[in-house]
Amino acid sequence: MMTGTIETTGNISAEKGGSIILQCHLSSTTAQVTQVNWEQQDQLLAICNADLGWHISPSFKDRVAPGPGLGLTLQSLTVNDTGEYFCIYHTYPDGTYTGRIFLEVLESSVAEHGARFQIP
């Protein structure tokens, strides 16, 4: 039986050009995490394998950095980065757990005061 739950950073509103950290945390299970995949829509962004470490998809290498932890840092944000991101935890013996985070990237002129802007 799958008893675990995924906690995420929560949805994030950020400004174009900034950077943000996407993070998920798997709790309430003793299952072993064998691999974590980060995906956007149907695109694979990165993989963190327990034995082999990190692999960043070539098309994202210049803007995606591994970590902190099992999280992912997205840099030089563009409006095209707006969308849903998935952290997919492959575990043994439980199986797969998935978390969802929506990232909204706003043009500077429409960004709310609460939107995050960080120098990459």
């Epitope: 929560g10 949805n11 994030i12 409006v79 709310e112 939107a115």
Partner: antibody, heavy 117, light 112 residues
Framework: EVQLQQSGPELVKPGASMKMSCKAS????????MSWVKQSHGKNLEWIGL????????SYNQKFKGKATLTVDKSSSTAYMELLSLTSEDSAVYYC??????????WGQGTSVTVSS | DVVVTQTPLSLPVSFGDQVSISCRSS???????????LSWYLHKPGQSPQLLIY???NRFSGVPDRFSGSGSGTDFTLKISTIKPEDLGMYYC?????????FGGGTKLEIK
């Protein structure tokens, strides 16, 4: 002035599908996401999902995955929602709403859908 | 999914009253950056819902200052300082911090 003009009421038969529209004006269509909301029988509001007009990316409430399909036509600044395999449970008023910072700041007037044989 | 509970379900008022509507979520609505995506809407009969408050306490443009929002974490409140006839209708809170976005069940503001 921001305006969202939705298509008119629909009477459809069970098992059929239908597509409603939401034409945006008064702002840059690709700068904001568009959400869709269901209101059944004048009761609770449910978030169906949203679409990013810039790249067509979508996010769905799992409850509506396979029931609703969201698309956009950038050239006409129009968002669409197709409802599939309709049943009486889908009879409702459906709203489109412009989204920013995870709130919905401007709403269409709503499209009433009645599913009946 | 995050469950959002609104109280009361119905709120009988007289014009000029001050009222509060409560909204509670099943988990914290603060994201990892400290931003909280909690908004409030008024839905009048025969009209579309309208945004009143976003980000807990920010009044949307054109919304009178008799409407105010407060709260943090899992507990949020909408206050209306002096009820006017145009304030009657259904009030909803919405959390947008976690996927999917979820609405409260609504509070009906009606005349006593």
């Amino acid at each position: 002035e921001v305006q969202l003009q939705q298509s008119g009421p629909e009477l459809v038969k069970p098992g059929a599908s239908m597509k409603m529209s939401c034409k945006a004006s008064g702002y840059s269509f690709t700068t904001y996401t568009m959400s869709w909301v269901k209101q059944s029988h004048g009761k609770n509001l449910e978030w169906i999902g949203l679409i990013n007009p810039y790249n067509g990316g979508t996010s769905y409430n799992q409850k509506f995955k396979g029931k609703a399909t969201l698309t956009v036509d950038k050239s006409s600044s129009t968002a669409y929602m197709e409802l599939l395999s309709l049943t009486s449970e889908d009879s409702a008023v459906y709203y489109c709403a412009r989204s920013r910072s995870f709130a919905m700041d401007y709403w269409g007037q709503g499209t009433s859908v009645t599913v009946s044989s | 999914d995050v469950v959002v509970t609104q109280t009361p379900l119905s709120l009988p008022v007289s014009f000029g009253d001050q009222v509060s509507i409560s909204c509670r979520s099943s988990q914290s609505l603060a994201n990892s950056y400290g931003d909280t995506y909690l908004s409030w809407y008024l839905h009048k009969p025969g009209q579309s819902p309208q945004l009143l408050i976003y980000g807990i306490s920010n009044r949307f443009s054109g919304v009178p200052d008799r409407f105010s929002g407060s709260g943090s974490g899992t507990d949020f409140t909408l206050k209306i300082s002096t009820i006017k006839p145009e304030d009657l209708g259904m009030y909803y809170c919405l959390q947008g911090t976690h996927q999917p976005w979820t609405f409260g069940g609504g509070t009906k503001l009606e005349i006593k």
